[in-house]
Amino acid sequence: YDFTNCDFQKIEADYLRTISKDLITYMSGTKSTDFNNTVSCSNRPHCLTEIQSLTFNPTPRCASLAKEMFARKTKATLALWCPGYSETQINATQAMKKRRKRKVTTNKCLEQVSQLLGLWRRFIRTLLKKQ
């Protein structure tokens, strides 16, 4: 999906109002220095591409993020403010229901969410630069 035509201001508002709080709650008990940020993004559409990938694509050591509250809110936000995004998710939703797994917060998942926080902050910064 090409995130170029999203309403970035509206996405930023949703992130600041609610998604950020859920990400921080997920990370509670860990320090910001516990993980190094290895994933970056260069512009707003690129940031959203990386955020989508890290949030919804299961990895061998962290398969359960898509069911977290911040992930559900991220999906809702993208579906709302990115034209045509919802139709790309119809089949993806069915596949996700089939592979539903037990929720386990592993260190790898914490690291992945730490990367997500970094990507979202980068998204906000690139937005501020444009303004």
Epitope: A13, A76, L80, G84, E87, I90, T93
Partner: antibody, heavy 120, light 107 residues
Framework: EEKLQQSGDDLVRPGAAVKMSCKAS????????MHWVKQRPGQGLEWIGT????????DYNQNFKGRATLTADKSSNTAYMELSRLTSEDSAVYYC?????????????WGQGASVTVSS | DIVLTQSPATLSVTPGESVSLSCRAS??????VHWFQQKSNESPRLLIK???QSISGIPSRFSGSGSGTDFTLNINRVESEDFSVYYC?????????FGTGTKLELK
């Protein structure tokens, strides 16, 4: 079974405001946005706006911005629409309709409609 | 805003005939079009989602096709209960919009 129960019909004066409700049952309230649609007698469907309980956010058709206010009470699974500064043009049937925000993405259940008559 | 134009405005048919209703978008909207039926004094009812996907409980005589800007609702062998108004709707981008409607009436 998913159900949307709307409040009753209303007769209101021009310039006044009306607040209607839409009580949801049979599904997880926060998994869906609540949309509001206007239909004047013998006319088509006009999208007013939506409230997304999961995100506590709303969006409006420009034609209704500033006059329509969409809210929801998550504890009672009820969505509300308040329409202010009413004129005769607002005499219509108003529908609420749910739409999935993390799946489905379509208005698959509708309320029975609430008729508003604006008259002095 | 995306404008949806439906044609014809009115379609007069006899039961048993097959009909096609058209919905044209003012800009490409992929497959983000849904079809609703509205009978007199009733709420709209979802018939087809995302241009061609069927809905549970809807008779198989209703089908949809199209993508981009041109969409079609087909009714195979119209039955008496099908006489009503049909609307297309786009959810490609906000604000969501409805088509102008097509009234299917008895000839």
């Amino acid at each position: 079974e998913e159900k949307l129960q709307q409040s009753g019909d209303d007769l209101v004066r021009p310039g006044a405001a009306v607040k209607m409700s839409c009580k949801a049952s049979g599904y997880i309230f926060t998994d869906y946005a609540m949309h509001w649609v206007k239909q004047r007698p013998g006319q088509g469907l006009e999208w007013i706006g939506t409230f997304i309980p999961l995100l506590d956010t709303s969006d409006y058709n420009q034609n209704f911005k500033g006059r329509a206010t969409l809210t929801a009470d998550k504890s009672s699974n009820t969505a509300y629409m308040e329409l202010s500064r009413l004129t005769s043009e607002d005499s219509a049937v108003y529908y609420c309709a749910r739409m999935g925000v993390t799946h489905s993405y379509v208005m698959d259940a509708w309320g029975q409609g609430a008729s508003v008559t604006v008259s002095s | 805003d995306i404008v949806l134009t439906q044609s014809p405005a009115t379609l007069s048919v006899t039961p048993g005939e097959s009909v096609s209703l058209s919905c044209r978008a003012s800009q490409p909207i992929s497959i983000s079009v849904h079809w609703f039926q509205q009978k007199s004094n009733e709420s709209p009812r979802l018939l087809i989602k995302f241009a061609s996907q069927s809905i549970s409980g809807i008779p198989s005589r209703f089908s949809g096709s199209g993508s981009g800007t041109d969409f079609t609702l087909n009714i195979n062998r119209v039955e008496s209960e099908d006489f009503s108004v049909y609307y297309c709707q786009q959810t490609f981008s906000l604000p969501y919009t409805f088509g102008t409607g097509t009234k299917l009436e008895l000839k």
